[in-house]
């Protein structure tokens, strides 16, 4: 969370940004809020990126002004016009690229004053893992798969019964490059699993941490997964 202040004459407005992460190939949001202003035609929103000449996006006099937009962002940006009234200057970024990572500035001007704040935008790939029982193996095993990760993550297994146990000797993890030659498919197999136990497959890089849980009993298999972005908020 970054809060910036700006001064215009004797007036300043608070602008707040949130560090966030973008999933390459998908749409992302760069979050920015400001003190709402009743005079809508005086609101100017500018998004800038460190090291880039020109603007990422500009919104003024009630509409987008893309005359100074850098070509790498052409056709990929939008503000949420209906949210500007409540002080939301967040930027929608379509088809996030690895090169979109960097430091962005959200600059706001209203009839009350001006202000700005920076945000760090990280880009990579992250996805939910899915764990299945691998009945084809010689001994009962679990297969944890996640389709898209970048940079290469670490994978670790844990179990509710054997807390603190090291499963690296009884697991095998592989990374398979996807067709776009950037992201990778993560596959990890855990051998010699026992029934009536809950196992967790944890995949983590510097952007995200994902966990898949599976509980295998005689009568049923229960699954749960969650994904958490790191250093956000």
């Amino acid at each position: 969370l970054i809060i910036g202040f700006g001064i215009s004459g004797k007036h300043f407005i608070t602008v707040t940004t949130f560090t966030s992460a973008g999933n390459i190939g998908e749409d992302g949001t760069l979050s920015c809020t400001f003190e709402p202003d009743i005079k809508l035609n005086g609101i100017v929103i500018q998004w800038l990126k460190e090291g880039i000449k020109g603007l990422v996006h500009e919104f003024k006099e009630g509409k987008d002004d893309l005359s100074q937009q850098h070509e790498m962002f052409r056709g990929r940006t939008a503000v949420f016009a209906d949210q500007v009234v409540v002080g939301n200057a967040s930027l929608r970024l379509k088809n996030v690229q690895l090169t979109d990572a960097g430091t962005y500035t959200c600059y706001i001007r209203t009839s009350k004053g001006k202000g700005n704040a920076n945000l760090e935008y990280k880009t990579g790939a992250f996805s939910m893992p899915e764990i299945n029982v691998d009945y084809n193996a010689s001994s009962e095993s679990l297969r944890c798969e996640a389709p898209r990760w970048f940079p290469q993550p670490t994978v670790a297994w844990a179990s509710q019964v054997d807390q603190g146990a090291n499963f690296s000797e009884v697991s095998n993890t592989s990374f398979e490059l996807n067709s776009e030659n950037v992201t990778m498919k993560v596959v990890s197999v855990l051998y010699n699993v026992t029934i009536n136990n809950t196992y967790s497959c944890m995949i983590e890089n510097d952007i995200a941490k994902a966990t898949g849980d599976i509980k295998v009993t005689d009568s049923e298999v229960k699954r749960r997964s969650q994904l958490q972005l790191l250093n956000s908020g």
């Epitope: 009743i38 809508l40 409540v86």
Partner: antibody, heavy 116, light 107 residues
Framework: QVQLVQSGAEVKKPGSSMRVSCKAS????????ISWVRQAPGQGLEWMGG????????NYAQKFQGRVTITADKSTSTAYMELSSLRSEDTAVYYC?????????WGQGTLVTVSS | EIVMTQSPASLSVSPGERATLSCRAS??????LAWYQQKPGQAPRLLIY???TRATGIPARVSGGGSGTEFTLTISSLQSEDFAVYCC?????????FGPGTKLEIK
């Protein structure tokens, strides 16, 4: 001087529709949002929705979604609020106001009575 | 939707004294809060926005404070024209929501 002038009081039958107008100055229309707020007899204020002609956006409170339509005619600087499928609980004073996010000028109010 | 509550529902104060009215939001609204005064048969009048900024023409004896979920409106040295209903409104998120109001009465 900012002025919001609303249409006159109406009596409506249950199931019918109502339409209230709100004429504003040209500057108000080009620079601000116009919202609609209602107040049932002896009750508090209730935001129904609003339009920001400069942004080309309109937002509605979920309670009224599908029943309320807010429009703006830039050529006459007039905003309209239409509420359909009226019931007795819709009896209220309907105000137009300059804003969101907050409301600094208000119309005089239009009393709409829904009665069979 | 953010629910606004106000306390007390009514308050009796003598002219010349101070009145403090409270408004609470069900979740943080930062400083995105306004206060209005309404007299019988009249439209509401904006007093405060941004939790503490007085609207044009509002006297200095009217002040607002607070942020997040807890807010106050204080009127020092009450005058006859101050006796009315006061309500708060959040504008952090759509839909905008109002508190039920506090009726300030002459003691």
């Amino acid at each position: 001087q900012v002025q919001l002038v609303q249409s006159g009081a109406e009596v409506k039958k249950p199931g019918s529709s109502m339409r209230v107008s709100c004429k504003a100055s040209e500057d108000t229309f080009s620079s601000y949002a116009i919202s609609w707020v209602r107040q049932a007899p002896g009750q508090g204020l209730e935001w129904m929705g609003g339009t920001a002609p400069i942004f080309g956006t309109t937002n509605y409170a979920q309670k009224f979604q599908g029943r309320v339509t807010i429009t703006a005619d830039k050529s006459t600087s007039t905003a309209y609020m239409e509420l359909s499928s009226l019931r007795s609980e819709d009896t209220a004073v309907y105000y137009c106001a300059r804003g969101g996010p907050y409301f600094d000028y208000w119309g005089q109010g239009t009393l709409v009575t829904v009665s069979s | 939707e953010i629910v606004m509550t106000q306390s007390p529902a009514s308050l009796s104060v003598s002219p010349g004294e101070r009145a403090t009215l409270s408004c609470r939001a069900s979740q943080s609204v930062s400083s995105n809060l306004a206060w209005y005064q309404q007299k019988p048969g009249q439209a509401p009048r904006l007093l405060i926005y941004g939790a503490s900024t007085r609207a044009t023409g509002i006297p200095a004896r009217v002040s607002g404070g607070g942020s997040g979920t807890e807010f106050t409106l204080t009127i020092s040295s009450l005058q006859s024209e101050d006796f009315a209903v006061y309500c708060c409104q959040q504008y952090k998120n759509w839909p905008f929501t109002f508190g039920p109001g506090t009726k300030l009465e002459i003691k």
